[in-house]
Interface confidence: medium
């Protein structure tokens, strides 16, 4: 049975140029943590293994950092990153939780942060 | 081109215990978590054991237990599974298989080897 | 446990016919499903991952659809060499389980 829920920074918006940390926290579980991968709509950004520590894509490694934690980091922002994040975490006993977080990348520099909300 | 050998397979009376090894060549085996599934004769395919990259975690379908055991030697490049207490259900052919964690996908398997358990 | 149920659990089909396969989960399962064929006498090999995409190498005849408890496996146009035992598994929650299989022949 899968008890937890992962909160994760929502719906955020950042400036062109900017950086951002996308952030996920599974809760109300025991489970362990083997694996955490963030993706881009189907293109795998990073992961973090709990043997092997932090792997970034190839074609993100200029614009990626891991951390802080289990989050991400997104540097040089275009308005091309635009878009649904997820993380992926994969625990065991539990299986696979997974969070959504949508990007909005702005020209201008009025960028607010959304509010935080959870997925089941 | 990557491979995966197993071996070990044999005939054991009830009760008994066998060690399967499986051999991978061709890819960073310390990189992959690693699986074992079995076939019983005509039936299908179930999830025997997965074992992490580094050696850190296990994981058992209830049914195996605490009678089966999946290790790995990094530097042999080297999968085994200890079965002890084996019973007739436990017969089959055992596939070691390579895990795509980021897809819960197994995406490369062995041959199989056949575990006979029979008096 | 998440059950798998595909249907049917044996097809006959012509060469050239399109051939579809379903399997159902006892709950949800997001996207976590993949396909596997198994030749007789053969290892399984993986054909589609994540509910619908193609593993490399895999012809494109081959496809998957679905989310959450329902999905479709696709043979466009069958092959002689498609004959095999074709198997859904769930990678949702452990312990990660797989469908009864269907088994595919031509006519």
């Known amino acids: 049975m899968m008890t937890g829920t992962i909160e994760t920074t929502g719906n955020i918006s950042a400036e062109k140029g900017g950086s951002i940390i996308l952030q996920c926290h599974l809760s109300s579980t025991t489970a362990q943590v083997t694996q955490v991968n963030w993706e881009q709509q189907d293109q795998l950004l990073a992961i973090c293994n709990a043997d092997l520590g932090w792997h970034i894509s190839p074609s993100f490694k200029d614009r990626v950092a891991p951390g802080p934690g289990l989050g991400l980091t997104l540097q040089s922002l275009t308005v091309n990153d635009t878009g649904e994040y997820f993380c992926i975490y994969h625990t065991y006993p539990d299986g696979t939780y997974t969070g959504r977080i949508f990007l909005e990348v702005l020209e201008s520099s009025v960028a607010e942060h959304g509010a935080r909300f959870q997925i089941p | 081109e990557v491979q995966l050998v197993e071996s070990g397979g044999g005939l054991v009376q009830p009760g008994g215990s066998l060690r399967l090894s499986c051999a991978a060549s061709g890819f960073t085996f310390s990189s992959y978590t690693m699986s074992w599934v079995r076939q019983a004769p005509g039936k299908g395919l179930e999830w025997v054991a997965t074992i992490s990259s580094g050696g850190s975690y296990t994981y058992y379908p209830d049914s195996v237990k605490g009678r089966f055991t999946i290790s790995r030697d990094n530097a042999k490049n080297t999968l085994y599974l200890q079965m002890n207490s084996l019973r007739a259900e436990d017969t089959a052919v055992y596939y070691c298989?390579?895990?795509?964690?980021?897809?819960?996908?197994?995406?490369?398997w062995g041959q199989g080897t056949l575990v006979t358990v029979s008096s | 446990d998440i059950q798998m149920t595909q249907s049917p659990s044996s097809l006959s089909a012509s060469v050239g016919d399109r051939v579809t396969i379903t399997c159902k989960a006892s709950q949800n399962i997001n996207v976590w499903l993949n396909w596997y064929q198994q030749k007789p006498g053969k290892a399984p090999k993986l054909l589609i991952y994540?509910?619908?995409n193609l593993q490399t190498g895999v012809p494109s005849r081959f496809s998957g659809s679905g989310s959450g408890t329902d999905f479709t496996f696709t043979i466009s146009s069958l092959q002689p060499e498609d004959i095999a035992t074709y198997y859904c598994?769930?990678?949702?929650?452990?312990?990660?389980?797989f469908g009864q299989g269907t088994k595919v022949e031509i006519k």
């Open positions: 994540k509910a619908s």
């Open positions: 298989t390579r895990w795509l964690l980021s897809l819960y996908a197994m995406d490369y």
């Open positions: 598994q769930q990678g949702q929650t452990y312990p990660f389980t």
